[in-house]
């Protein structure tokens, strides 16, 4: 699984749904800002 790079990627809200004619990525931060280490990458396992 790849690490998540906060600095190089832009982000799109997964659940908001999309305008069928206009897909775009927002430039806001990812949905969770880690409290303990806000600049460290995070990853997610699909099957725990």
């Amino acid at each position: 699984m790849e690490d998540f790079n906060m600095e190089s990627d832009s982000f799109e809200d997964f659940w908001k749904g999309e305008d069928l004619s206009n897909y775009s990525y927002s430039s806001t931060l990812p949905p969770f800002l880690l409290d303990a280490a806000p600049c460290e990458p995070e990853s997610l396992e699909i099957n725990k």
């Epitope: 990627d9 799109e12 997964f14 659940w15 931060l29 949905p31 303990a36």
Partner: antibody, heavy 120, light 116 residues
């Protein structure tokens, strides 16, 4: 790793309300929508709506309009879903979920689920 | 008629390739939608696998193996989840979903059984 941690199972009487919480453990809620999805026993998922944690803005599925209320308390990184006028067919596992996509892939987070049983 | 229709069950042997279909209701054109696919195992929430609209508009879920892929069959007005090199751990329920009329709509799911 960020996790969404939900409140425990509930048993409710028909006509009453239930309020389920969803806390971001290890992180803080940000601007991305938190959806609530329920799943009745043996059935597929059913989307109930979402809340924008920053603004508090909501988008409810038509089926639940007038019966569901989604709120959040950013000071404790927690979102809430309240469903009123409960019926037996509201018996389901209720999940919160959030996530985002970057050009390199999508990251989707789910709570562990909260079983709500509606029974007289 | 349901917005999204999936076959209720499917079985295949380890190592095989399987195609799970998600047929959109007549009047809803598959070419206009991203089709989202989820895997769910008993006692766990659904897990996002991938979304697919076209070869230039597709994304994998984080950590999802490349043997899970998407496509579409325009003639059948259906989205397709292809699982290659089937493994025993792929035994699960699979759901498709689309964003339609300002709401997320899920299919009824396909129960995939891995034989043997």
């Amino acid at each position: 790793q960020v996790q969404l941690v939900q409140s425990g199972a509930e048993v409710k009487k028909p006509g009453s309300s239930v309020k389920v919480s969803c806390k971001a453990s290890g992180g803080t809620l940000s601007s991305y929508a938190i959806s609530w999805v329920r799943q009745a026993p043996g059935q597929g998922p059913e989307w109930m709506g979402w809340i924008n944690p920053n603004s508090g803005g909501t988008n409810y599925a038509q089926k639940f309009q007038g019966r569901v209320t989604m709120t959040r308390d950013t000071s404790i990184s927690t979102a809430y879903m309240e469903l009123s006028r409960l019926r037996p067919d509201d018996t389901a596992v209720y999940y919160c979920a959030s996530g985002y996509c970057s050009p390199s892939g999508c990251y989707v987070y789910w709570g562990q689920g909260t079983l709500v049983t509606v029974s007289s | 008629q349901a917005v999204l229709t999936q076959p209720s069950s499917l079985s295949a042997s380890p190592g095989a390739s399987v195609s799970l279909t998600c047929t959109l209701r007549s009047g809803i054109n598959v070419g206009a939608y991203r089709i989202y696919w989820y895997q769910q195992k008993p006692g766990s929430p659904p897990q996002f696998l991938l979304r697919y609209k076209s070869d230039s508009d597709k994304q994998q879920g984080s950590g999802v193996p490349s043997r899970f892929s998407g496509s579409r069959d325009a003639s059948a007005n259906a989205g397709i989840l292809l699982i290659s090199g089937l493994r025993s751990e792929d035994e699960a329920d699979y759901y498709c979903a689309i964003w339609h009329s300002s709401a997320w709509v899920f299919g009824g799911g396909t129960q995939l059984t891995v034989l043997g």
